[in-house]
């Protein structure tokens, strides 16, 4: 239910596009320590034909909850660019049933403070990585949009 | 348009080991998520393993020390191999792609495998 | 595991006639403002079809007859006016947790 504006790309390349690349830029670093297993939103959320509307929405939902995460204001700035950029390019009409969103990552059972700090560590890394991808997807699919491929 | 083509199925003594495949064509093969789902005679459906675009895995915990799920994105196909092979293992394997909300977009026709001695 | 449980196992239907399948899930599919539920069609000796996903999404290329409703635990297909290509066997099918589960399946015959 999204009738994706702004498909001849200028609003996508002058604004979304640069801000998806500070980003990734800022994230260089992060790759190589990331696990291989697979995160449950791109099991479930894909950038497929005919459905690139429903995964760029969803991916711009799971954005927002990546804000004031990272320290930088930079950071944050170019993250919400994304978010509501997409959300407003994409013009979509039917809003998905609002529900509480899901925290980022699961709670941990009280360990000591060394332990702790380790798994903070973990999680930060995880969610950095989740990130990291999320961006990747969300530039790809526009890309597919804007290429105008409808591939199955 | 998307295609998948089991292949490997037959008759096979219990205990006996068997691989199946599954070429694709039609899509980004290396782009997807792909899953093995199986059917006995006149049953219903039962979800075995999927493999994801990393080459990470999932099992159905049920048939995770017998079969194992693989693909090889340069011949864009899909594999599972079977191991101590059962007489309840009779039924139509089929590969499918992964969908939008984790479902089963795209099927192929099955290969039968009939464990028997 | 989560269970699913299909009603009826099967019915009678005549063309025209307003069909609803229901699937009760052992526990909620629904996870972060979605329900992973989707329904296939299956024919004898064929591959099933995939109708519908996410609940309620209407899968490309499938009649608008065909419509999904539900979220948590309570699902239904419906088939608005049955055609007679509609005779066959519907499973539903949960995606929120691994081991992805279906349920027993609906024969829709013809009476």
């Known amino acids: 239910d999204c009738d994706i504006e702004g498909k001849d790309g200028k609003q996508y390349e002058s604004v979304l596009m640069v801000s998806i690349d500070q980003l990734l830029d800022s994230m260089k670093e992060i790759g190589s320590n990331c696990l291989n297993n697979e995160f449950n939103f791109f099991k479930r959320h894909i950038c497929d034909a005919n459905k690139e509307g429903m995964f760029l929405f969803r991916a711009a939902r799971k954005l927002r909850q990546f804000l004031k995460m990272n320290s930088t204001g930079d950071f944050d700035l170019h993250l919400l660019k994304v978010s509501e950029g997409t959300t407003i390019l994409l013009n979509c009409t039917g809003q998905v049933k609002g529900r509480k969103p899901a925290a980022l990552g699961e709670a941990q059972p009280t360990k000591s403070l060394e332990e702790n700090k380790s798994l903070k560590e973990q999680k930060k890394l995880n969610d950095l990585c989740f990130l990291k991808r999320l961006l990747q997807e969300i530039k790809t699919c526009w890309n597919k949009i804007l290429m105008g491929t409808k591939e199955h | 348009q998307v295609q998948l083509v089991e292949s490997g199925g037959g008759v096979v003594q219990p205990g006996r080991s068997l691989r199946l495949s599954c070429a694709a064509s039609?899509?980004?093969?290396?782009?997807?998520?792909l899953h093995w789902v199986r059917q006995a005679p006149g049953k219903g459906l039962e979800w075995l393993a999927a493999?994801?675009?990393?080459?990470?895995?999932d099992y159905n915990a049920e048939f995770s020390s017998r079969f194992t799920i693989s693909r090889d994105n340069s011949k864009n196909t899909l594999y599972l191999q079977m191991n101590s092979l059962r007489a309840e293992d009779t039924a139509v394997y089929y590969c499918?792609?992964?969908?939008?909300?984790?479902?089963?977009?795209?099927w192929g026709q099955g290969t039968l495998v009939t464990v028997s001695s | 595991d989560i269970q699913m449980t299909q009603s009826p196992s099967s019915l009678s239907a005549s063309v025209g006639d307003r069909v609803t399948i229901t699937c009760k899930a052992s526990?909620?599919?629904?996870?972060?403002?979605?329900?992973?539920m989707n329904w296939y069609q299956q024919k004898p000796g064929k591959a099933p079809k995939l109708l519908i996903y996410?609940?309620?999404n209407l899968e490309s290329g499938v009649p608008a007859r065909f419509s999904g409703s539900g979220s948590g635990t309570d699902f239904t297909l419906t088939i608005s006016s049955l055609q007679p290509e509609d005779f066959a066997t519907y499973y539903c099918?949960?995606?929120?947790?691994?081991?992805?589960?279906f349920g027993g399946g609906t024969k829709v015959e013809i009476k």
């Open positions: 996410m609940a309620s």
């Open positions: 099918q949960q995606s929120n947790e691994d081991p992805l589960t």
């Open positions: 493999i994801w675009t990393g080459g990470s895995t």
């Open positions: 526990h909620s599919v629904d996870d972060d403002g979605d329900s992973y």
């Open positions: 499918a792609r992964n969908g939008y909300g984790e479902s089963f977009a795209y």
């Open positions: 039609g899509f980004t093969f290396s782009s997807y998520g």
